[in-house]
């Protein structure tokens, strides 16, 4: 299980109204469901049920984005429309350059993602849990512009930085 180093850059409004940035570093794991590649893009939060919809007319994003999916407790969705792997595939089909799963409430998903596949995705599929997942979701839930960069090697920076 290889470590994925994730840098999340949050673009916020400063008191002057212009953009300022806050960078947070966290770690996850590359799953066998995808490729061990670097990726970078704007974060798009996706609800697990939102990935069930297979409407071909649904807008595909026209740029590389990083899908973030917080998985729910299995009891809340006893008959899921797709497996976790299927959800990752659906996100990549829609244009995701990478998918990050928060598996804190569904740790069984780790085994599903690591079962391996004869046809793994060509984009990284990362999972996070615990404190790292909390940090990620706190940023995502702000519903502001945030970008994620996923790397196989640790970044050379300190992980907390304020630009004023």
């Amino acid at each position: 299980k290889e470590t994925a180093f994730v840098e999340v850059v949050l673009f916020e409004s400063s008191p002057s109204g212009d953009y300022t940035t806050h960078t947070t570093g966290l770690t996850g794991r590359f799953s066998r469901a995808g490729a061990m590649l670097s990726a970078e893009g704007e974060i798009v939060q996706m609800h697990p049920l939102g990935l069930c919809n297979n409407n071909d007319e649904e807008d595909l994003y026209e740029y590389g984005w990083v899908g973030v999916v917080k998985l729910e407790q299995p009891e809340l969705d006893p008959k899921p429309c797709l497996t976790v792997l299927g959800k990752a595939k659906r996100a990549v089909q829609r244009g995701a350059t990478a998918v990050i799963f928060d598996v804190s409430e569904n740790p069984e998903a780790i085994d599903q993602l690591n079962q391996g596949s004869e046809d793994p995705l060509k984009r990284p599929v990362v999972y996070v849990k615990g404190a790292d997942a909390i940090k990620l979701m706190n940023i995502v839930n702000k519903q502001k512009v945030a970008r994620a960069r996923i790397q196989h090697l640790p970044p050379r920076q300190p992980t907390e930085y304020f630009d004023m």
């Epitope: 673009f11 953009y19 300022t20 994003y61 740029y63 984005w65 970008r147 630009d163």
Partner: nanobody
Amino acid sequence: QVQLQESGGGLVQAGGSLRLSCAASGTISYAHIMGWYRQAPGKERELVAGISQGSITNYADSVKGRFTISRDNAKNTVYLQMNSLKPEDTAVYYCAVISYDYIKSVPFRYWGQGTQVTVSS
């Protein structure tokens, strides 16, 4: 490197409308946020509006409800629809691309040449 070409400025009466356009070319993958800034004579350059690749927008308080920013990712173009213009909106309007330098941990900007917007009373 990113090149930006603005158009759409001009002279308009108070209460009127204008639509600014800005086409980006070059390394467009850097265009994390595209936005419009303005600089009135004797004042600092200020953000008017910005929009991310995923269409998350940010507006200056002074233009909320009057200006609308939009973006066409396929054409690498950003637009600023300006309605109910006021004399205090008179300024040079600059298109900008805001990106992020992961090595230095700082955002950086590419600027257009600017287009003059004059609102007469």
